[in-house]
């Protein structure tokens, strides 16, 4: 925030001796010193720390106040830590006092201490030790005080040392007015300060070229009586296609863009995009590259991925496992997924049609994030072609040919499906007659059925099997009054089907010659 300072005194600007008044003469001493940038300057130092009750005064020359009402005094000084001075803890101080005296003219070399008005006691934010001193860490304190309103033509400043070890490195006296500035891309003109100390003058700013006011937030500032611009409210921002450079808005260069006034800077066009004029608010995609609808303007234009690589398969009867490697080129995107297209092909013409909905895919057919899939429930002894396509967020925007990896296979003979409808036809003391239905999918010629049975309380520790070619069988030599578990599976050249669900049957008690049908106790799926 720029403030116009009208300098009335700047000790650092003076190359010759300052020749201020020191009283007593053995107190403040004018020496050549160095400022924080090691530039030679005139400084005053005092270090009368051995004796108590010090009262060393230093007075500036008479300062004409010009048009000022309120005066600012900036002091830069170093103060040595009393702990770094041996044996002076009782007498050493770490503050000094600042005074002023108003007068219409230079009153000469005599300091009349009683006429001076105290401004403040000045303490260091940072004092330094002997060790710091050695490293030339001259910890420069800056203190600003104000005086006024002043009524006379000028004044003196005076510094009273009461026993500190100080060097006054710089004394600057000035007044301020609000000067024309550009703030938040708005121009605020020179403004006369308010007459009262507390008054603030509100000034409305005008946006610089190619800037616009932020929505419902027009730029305003307040000029204080201290000559400072305060409380910026609102701002201007560079329009789309323009960026801030210092206090102006400049157009984005070629190959750069800015999509919104809310963005701070122009950005280089993302990869595979371009802008061929200045002041662009967006970049166009190169041929063959696209932006997905959800892609923000700052992301690179991308393209569909190449085909998956190294597609391999494994056939297990009517199940096919496919596995592949990611595409060599993901198109510049991280949202690559895979989709599987299954086609069943005829033996003769080689014509292929989509497989239909009765095929199973594990984990899924589309949106696959992993690079493997299992295709189940295929027909036995059938020809299939599987196309594995990598897709990303811009695949559907591309009109170019699909890229995929394909493999053609022939399924083997499948094992039969599960036997169903197992029924108890007759139950005796030592025999049970069962019947069942052929599997829904025999997947070939059923050569026989295998019946597995065991006493329920044996829990399949020992079981017996019986084979039959028909869909019924009588199981003999059973124990009377015993619960048996029965399961049946079909057998083809391709192998064994899954066992049917368990069927519990209780044979009749030996004492009773009565015939009745035992009831099923439970029924559950039991794998092969």
């Amino acid at each position: 925030q720029a403030a116009k300072e009208v300098l009335l005194l700047d000790s650092k600007a003076q190359q010759t001796e300052l020749e201020w008044i020191s009283s007593p003469p053995s107190g403040w001493e004018e020496i050549s010193g160095l400022d924080e940038n090691y530039t030679p300057i005139r400084t005053y130092q005092v270090c009368q720390v051995m004796e108590p009750n010090q009262n060393n005064w230093l007075r500036t020359n008479w300062i004409s106040k010009g048009n000022a009402q309120r005066i600012f005094v900036e002091l830069k000084f170093t103060l040595r830590d009393c702990n770094s001075l041996p044996g002076v803890l009782g007498t050493c101080k770490e503050t000094f006092n600042l005074y002023y005296y108003e007068t219409d003219y230079d009153t000469g070399r005599n300091i009349r201490e009683n006429l001076y008005v105290k401004i403040d006691t000045i303490a260091a934010d940072e004092s330094f030790t002997q060790g710091d001193l050695g490293e030339r860490k001259m910890k420069l304190n800056t203190e600003v005080r104000e005086i006024g309103p002043l009524s006379k033509k000028g004044f003196y400043l005076a510094f009273q040392d009461v026993g500190a070890c100080i060097a006054l490195v710089s004394v600057k006296v000035y007044y301020k007015k609000c000067w024309s500035i550009v703030e938040n891309l708005a121009v605020f003109p020179d403004t006369v300060t308010g007459s009262e100390f507390s008054s603030l003058v509100e000034v409305r700013g005008t946006c610089v070229s190619s800037a616009e006011e932020e929505a419902e937030n027009s730029p305003r500032m307040h000029c204080s009586a201290e000559g400072e611009w305060l409380v910026p409210i609102g701002k201007c921002i560079c329009k789309a296609g323009y960026q801030q450079k210092g206090d102006t808005c400049e157009p984005c260069g070629r190959r750069f863009y800015k999509s919104s006034s809310q963005d701070l800077q122009c950005s280089r066009c993302p990869t595979h995009s371009f802008s061929d004029r200045e002041g662009s608010s967006r970049c166009e995609c190169e041929d063959g590259y696209y932006r997905a609808p959800s892609d923000p303007p700052y992301v690179a234009c991308t393209r569909p991925p190449s085909a998956p690589q190294n597609l391999i398969f494994n056939i297990n009867q009517t199940t096919v496992s496919l596995e592949w490697s990611p595409p060599a080129d993901n198109g510049g995107r991280n949202d690559v997924t895979y989709r599987i297209l299954c086609k069943r092909c005829s033996w003769e013409q080689g014509e292929c049609v989509p497989c239909g909905s009765n095929i199973g895919y594990m984990p899924q057919q589309t949106g696959l994030e992993d690079n493997y899939v299992t295709v189940m429930d295929l027909l036995a002894h059938a020809n299939y072609t599987f196309e594995v396509e990598a897709v990303n967020g811009v695949s559907d925007l591309s009109r170019s040919q699909r890229l995929f990896a394909a493999v053609s296979i022939t399924t083997g003979q499948a094992a039969p499906s599960q036997v169903s409808g197992v029924m108890k036809e007759r139950v005796l003391q030592r025999s049970v007659q069962l019947s069942w239905q052929e599997p829904e999918h025999p997947n070939g010629v059923i050569t026989e059925y295998e019946i597995k049975y065991y006493e329920k309380d044996q829990r399949e520790r020992t079981y017996s099997t019986l084979k039959t070619k028909s869909t019924s069988a009588s199981i003999n030599n059973l124990k009377p009054g015993t619960v048996y578990v029965f399961q049946i599976r079909a057998v083809t050249a391709a192998g064994y089907g899954n066992y049917s669900p368990r069927l519990d049957v209780a044979t009749l008690e030996e004492a009773s010659g009565k015939m009745f049908e035992a009831t099923a106790v439970s029924s559950e799926q039991n794998p092969v």
Partner: antibody, heavy 121, light 106 residues
Framework: QVQLLQSGAEVKKPGASVKVPCKAS????????MSWVRQAPGQGLEWMGW????????TYAQGFTGRFVFSLDTSVSTAYLQISSLKAEDTAVYYC??????????????WGQGTLVTVSS | EIVLTQSPATLSVSPGERATLSCRAS??????LAWYQQKPGQAPRLLIY???TRPTGIPDRFSASGSGTDFTLTISRVEPEDFAVYYC????????FGQGTKVEIK
């Protein structure tokens, strides 16, 4: 003009004592500390210690405790160095020097002309 | 205690030449170092304090630098009255002098 005035040469026998005065003028005596420095014939400078002229509190360097005593008489702006049980190796020029503390560093800015103390049997 | 070692012990220069004297401390003394000049039969004279600050009245041909353990006193153009012994002195909790460097006419 700031000055430190020391007494003339002293010749002493071993075991004797000597008191070397250092009279200050041209400044407020109690506003600056006073240091003592020894220089044996043909040798370098050796700092013996210093005394706070305001409080009278002395500080002695290593090797200068016991036989060496710093004292003051502020009424006549004079600092004293007393050496007891003199030995031949105490033969040297003894300087008083005003200590200057400043913001930028410390040093001995005003020196007396020195007092030669000769210890000989 | 901190030991100060000055080098060289003797430096032979012609008037108008540059003289560079070195002082090394056995441990860091920050910049708590002063330089003194002593002519035969005279008391020492303070040349530099705070490692690099010149008191009023010391000619600007004398300059000094350094901090920590390594310090240098430079006489840019040696005048006839500069032939003397120069001592460095550190002022930490206890003060010590270096053994001195004699600057003599070449």
């Amino acid at each position: 003009q700031v000055q430190l005035l020391q007494s003339g040469a002293e010749v002493k026998k071993p075991g004797a004592s000597v008191k070397v005065p250092c009279k200050a003028s041209g400044y407020t005596f109690t506003s600056r500390a006073m240091s003592w420095v020894r220089q044996a014939p043909g040798q370098g400078l050796e700092w013996m210690g210093w005394i706070n002229t305001n409080t009278g509190n002395p500080t002695y360097a290593q090797g200068f405790t016991g036989r060496f005593v710093f004292s003051l008489d502020t009424s006549v702006s004079t600092a004293y160095l007393q050496i007891s049980s003199l030995k031949a190796e105490d033969t040297a020029v003894y300087y008083c020097a005003r200590v200057r503390f400043t913001v930028y560093g410390d040093g001995m800015d005003v020196w007396g002309q020195g007092t030669l103390v000769t210890v000989s049997s | 205690e901190i030991v100060l070692t000055q080098s060289p012990a003797t430096l032979s220069v012609s008037p108008g030449e540059r003289a560079t004297l070195s002082c090394r401390a056995s441990q860091s003394v920050s910049s708590n170092l002063a330089w003194y000049q002593q002519k035969p039969g005279q008391a020492p004279r303070l040349l530099i304090y705070g490692a690099s600050t010149r008191p009023t009245g010391i000619p600007d041909r004398f300059s000094a630098s350094g901090s920590g353990t390594d310090f240098t006193l430079t006489i840019s153009r040696v005048e006839p009255e500069d032939f003397a012994v120069y001592y460095c002195q550190q002022y930490g909790p206890s003060w010590t002098f270096g053994q001195g460097t004699k600057v003599e006419i070449k």
